[in-house]
């Protein structure tokens, strides 16, 4: 499936108010979410400690309090930058940024800018993607994912954090994005409700049933809190989920476990899987722009890479996704997406000539924007 080109606007459906925000990438990992080092010998493995290997492993410093009130960078793991590409150190130092960070919700009060001023920034996400206006950038090479195939053991943590379902990823999953390299920290999903789509990004106003986000930390930064708000500090891979005729076996490995974490704050362990199988197979065609986390703290400088190809799930699977989990206050966890935000002059780049496709509403192909990275 390819993204629709120049479709008629369809009702957005999602009950997301202007500041609806889904679980954002933002969910940055909390320390417990943060993968710690492996455990080879050497660290003495005290009971209750993770065993982290690696010479440079510093002792794990636990933040003073883990209570529910701290910055739910919750789900961006703060991984210490490895001196060695595959070796995230312990992530002890997540700065807590204020109690109110975890009290936001989709729709209603408090307004997000009050939770985090960055949510009122000029370069926010998600956005509406208009392929005809995208700038074709031949310099955008096919994405490379390394280490995304995980054996069933060790298992991974799957958690209902009240605004999404999130899978914490182990150290060593690496994405090559242009000249830089990024470590995958966690993935989570955004969805709608019965008969109502819930993707965050839209294409020509069309909202898809759901969207997956794989959140990455640039190897230029040691921890998520250092990367927040810095250009390119975080990168998110996004793909739209659509309804197809067959069950998606990769997604079923996660969806089949949602009942175990129906309650907000609950978690379970799931066997490792091929994370790349949750993404489209075509890594060469995508859109890219600079935006923000889609939930508080809404930090900007995030590089978004949105696949042109979609992922197909069965109708039953999409229903399971939108109808199983519960959020805060005995409410169903649904419609967890933020409204699209203005581009404010930003140009979305495409790794392929997206604007040149013929489409029902364009007599002549148009390419209004030029690639910023091109030209030498």
């Amino acid at each position: 499936q390819r993204l629709p080109r120049m479709q008629e606007d369809s009702p957005l459906g999602g009950g997301s108010s202007g500041e609806d925000d889904p679980l954002g990438e933002e969910d940055l990992p909390s320390e417990e979410d943060s993968p710690r080092e492996e455990d080879p010998p050497g660290e003495e493995d005290l009971p209750g400690e993770e065993d982290l290997p690696g010479e440079e492993d510093l002792p794990e410093v636990k933040p003073k309090s883990e209570e529910e009130g701290s910055l739910k960078l919750e789900d961006l793991p703060t991984v210490e930058a490895p001196g060695d590409p595959q070796e995230p150190q312990n992530n002890a130092h997540r700065d807590k940024e204020g109690d109110d960070q975890s009290h936001w919700r989709y729709g209603g009060d408090p307004p997000w800018p009050r939770v985090s001023p960055a949510c009122a920034g000029r370069f926010q996400s998600p956005v509406d993607i208009r392929p005809q206006l995208a700038a074709f950038c031949p310099a955008l090479r096919p994405l490379e994912l390394l280490g995304f195939q995980l054996p069933p053991l060790p298992e991974l943590r799957l958690r209902n954090n009240g605004h999404s379902v999130q899978l914490t990823l182990p150290p060593g999953l690496e994405m090559a994005l242009g000249p830089g390299r990024e470590y995958a920290l966690q993935l989570h999903l955004h969805w709608g409700a019965a008969g109502r789509p819930g993707s965050e990004h839209t294409v020509e106003g069309h909202r898809f049933p759901a969207e997956i986000h794989v959140v990455h930390l640039s190897t230029a930064f040691a921890r998520v809190d250092e990367a927040l708000g810095r250009p390119g500090g975080l990168a998110v891979l996004a793909a739209f989920l659509e309804e197809g005729p067959e069950e998606n076996s990769a997604y079923e490995q996660l969806l089949s476990r949602l009942e175990e974490i129906a309650e907000e704050g609950s978690e379970t362990q799931v066997p490792g899987l091929d994370i790349s199988a949750l993404l489209p197979s075509d890594f060469s065609r995508y859109f890219q722009y600079e935006g923000s986390l889609t939930t508080p703290p809404c930090a900007q400088g995030v590089i978004w890479t949105v696949f042109n190809q979609t992922v197909m799930l069965s109708a039953k699977q999409l229903h399971t996704l939108s109808d199983t989990l519960w959020g805060p206050g005995d409410s169903r966890l649904q419609l967890n997406f933020r409204a699209t935000q203005p581009l404010n002059g930003r140009v979305i780049e495409a790794s392929f000539p997206a604007g040149v496709d013929s489409s029902p509403r364009a007599a002549e192909p148009v390419q209004l924007n030029s690639c910023l990275a091109a030209g030498d």
């Epitope: 492996e38 455990d39 080879p40 010998p41 003495e44 009971p47 290997p53 091929d274």
Partner: antibody, heavy 119, light 111 residues
Framework: QVQLQESGGGLVQPGGSLRLSCAAS????????MSWVRQAPGKGLEWVSA????????YYADSVKGRFTISRDNSKNTLYLQMNSLRAEDTAVYYC????????????WGQGTLVTVSS | QSVLTQPPSVSGAPGQRVTISCTGS?????????VHWYQQLPGTAPKLLIY???NRPSGVPARFSGSKSATSASLAITGLQADDEADYYC??????????FGGGTKLTLLR
């Protein structure tokens, strides 16, 4: 520090049964997947079985499937391998090993216990 | 016959550099699964030497390094010492067979 101590090995006749134990200490046992690996005399390493931290997921090599059962008692910090219908080719030193929290590597190994299947 | 293929033996003089290869297929290393290396000194249990392709556990000297390419991996040992004489095994995961080891490589020091 992490310690793994296997026990229960010995001489058994073909068709017989044996139960190996591995006592673990020095880490939060229930948080880690565990594995059994064996080594026949003068031969290389062969993976036998693995189990998740909760005990809810188990995995077996084809050569032992249906005959061996891996289990754990997290309250006793102990890993088990129940071996039934033993064959001469099961003769080996059996090691228990701790799988990493975030890596599939076997970060710590016990000293091993010898199982000899012979009539 | 092991799923991962290693040379049965390698040798080198003290101070030299040796490499041990580990060749897999598209269902294991080639599929992207990580490779780990173990050292087994005579009469002892194996010990983790390199995990996740390139990482050294604490206590393992920097003389040991790992790398991985398409369907194979390598262990390099520089500045060979007498106590490096041991058997070395690579290990990965195979989508059909679960966890798999190489057949092992015996490192002999030339004196």
């Amino acid at each position: 520090q992490v310690q793994l101590q296997e026990s229960g090995g010995g001489l058994v006749q073909p068709g017989g049964s044996l139960r190996l134990s591995c006592a673990a200490s020095g880490f939060t046992f229930s948080s880690y997947a565990m594995s059994w690996v064996r080594q026949a005399p003068g031969k290389g390493l062969e993976w036998v079985s693995a189990i998740s931290g909760s005990g809810g997921s188990t995995y077996y090599a084809d050569s032992v499937k249906g005959r061996f059962t891996i289990s754990r008692d997290n309250s006793k910090n102990t890993l088990y391998l129940q071996m039934n219908s033993l064959r001469a080719e099961d003769t080996a030193v059996y090691y228990c090993a701790k799988i990493g929290r975030y890596s599939s590597s076997l970060g710590y190994w016990g000293q091993g216990t010898l199982v000899t299947v012979s009539s | 016959q092991s799923v991962l293929t290693q040379p049965p033996s390698v040798s080198g003089a003290p101070g030299q550099r040796v490499t041990i290869s580990c060749t897999g297929s598209s269902s294991n290393i080639g599929r992207g699964y990580n490779v780990h290396w173990y050292q087994q000194l005579p009469g002892t249990a194996p010990k983790l030497l390199i995990y996740d392709n390139t990482n050294r556990p604490s206590g393992v000297p920097a003389r040991f390094s790992g790398s991985k390419s398409a369907t194979s991996a390598s262990l390099a040992i520089t500045g060979l010492q007498a106590d490096d004489e041991a058997d070395y095994y690579c290990q990965s995961y195979d989508s059909g067979l679960r966890w798999v080891f190489g057949g092992g490589t015996k490192l002999t020091l030339l004196r």
